[in-house]
């Protein structure tokens, strides 16, 4: 049976928590990604940013999960208007910011 949206979001939050808690060396070797606007279309925007990080096993599950939330196909090099203009941050900070935002969405009951 299909996973309820609340459960799917909880799984994504759990994965991001695990990444932030288990981080020892710099996440993805300190790779930089585009910062995104978290106010709308967060899942696709996050995927568009993170999909450009390759060879980082720590975030592969997150990439797959975000893919499940984003209704359209996302490929590397694709950038939406949700990107914060010319601002790049480390993957570790990106994950932390995304986690804070998703936890708020979950607490508000915004699962889709």
């Amino acid at each position: 049976s299909p996973v309820p949206p609340s459960t799917a979001l909880k799984e994504l939050i759990e994965e991001l928590v695990n990444i932030t808690q288990n981080q020892k060396a710099p996440l993805c070797n300190g790779s930089m990604v585009w910062s995104i606007n978290l106010t709308a279309g967060v899942y696709c925007a996050a995927l568009e940013s993170l999909i450009n990080v390759s060879g980082c096993s720590a975030i592969e599950k997150t990439q797959r999960m975000l893919n499940g939330f984003c209704p359209h196909k996302v490929s590397a090099g694709q950038f939406s208007s949700l990107r914060v203009r010319d601002t790049k941050i480390e993957v570790a900070q990106f994950v932390k910011d995304l986690l804070v935002h998703l936890k708020k969405l979950f607490r508000e009951g915004q699962f889709n």
């Epitope: 996973v3 609340s6 459960t7 939050i13 759990e14 928590v17 808690q21 009951g109």
Partner: antibody, heavy 123, light 107 residues
Framework: EVTLRESGPGLVKPTQTLTLTCTLY??????????VDWIRQPPGKGLEWLAH???????RYNPALKSRLTISKDTSKNQVVLKLTSVDPVDTATYYC???????????????WGQGTLVTVSS | DIQMTQSPSSLSASVGDRVTISCRAS??????LNWYQQKPGKAPKLLIF???KLHSGVPSRFSGSGSGTDYTLTISSLQPEDIATYYC?????????FGGGTKVEIK
Amino acid sequence: EVTLRESGPGLVKPTQTLTLTCTLYGFSLSTSDMGVDWIRQPPGKGLEWLAHIWWDDVKRYNPALKSRLTISKDTSKNQVVLKLTSVDPVDTATYYCARTVSSGYIYYAMDYWGQGTLVTVSS
Amino acid sequence: DIQMTQSPSSLSASVGDRVTISCRASQDIRNYLNWYQQKPGKAPKLLIFYTSKLHSGVPSRFSGSGSGTDYTLTISSLQPEDIATYYCQQGLTPPLTFGGGTKVEIK
């Protein structure tokens, strides 16, 4: 020591609005990851969750009662207030407030409870 | 809403007995299952959260297990002070829901 204390009118007439206050001791609702829930228990029956408020004012309600419930907080007094409108005798119950702490994962586990306040709805 | 079904609704056991209470959720709740103890005339107290984590001050004779939709509370050796009603509660997402309760008595 973490303590919660409920206060209410004891007796309310049908159609009136019930106002309950939960005063928090030993922790502050202005602290990140803190939340407070209201739960009620009719005499001799089980527990029913009513509403929840987080430190950042995010609120959630029991859908069956949402149109009649309002939860709010007064951080300066360290209090959480629950209002239930248009009360009926079936709303007679002991009303409890309880604390939820959520760090990391979001648990929704109520780790400390008040002693409860009995509210009777009768004319 | 997620429905929680507890069984049995009541049980009677002797001091020292191993007691198990079951709780079933209407959907996978990913281990977000809490157990409470309520003694007559008192407020509920948290015993176990997140399926198996003991709340501070709870005796080690209490334990929890389970996954998916099925969860269990075990009292390894029933004591007279354990006479109470026990409730499970899903903590995955609001609306938070409780099981109907299991009343534990001494034979």
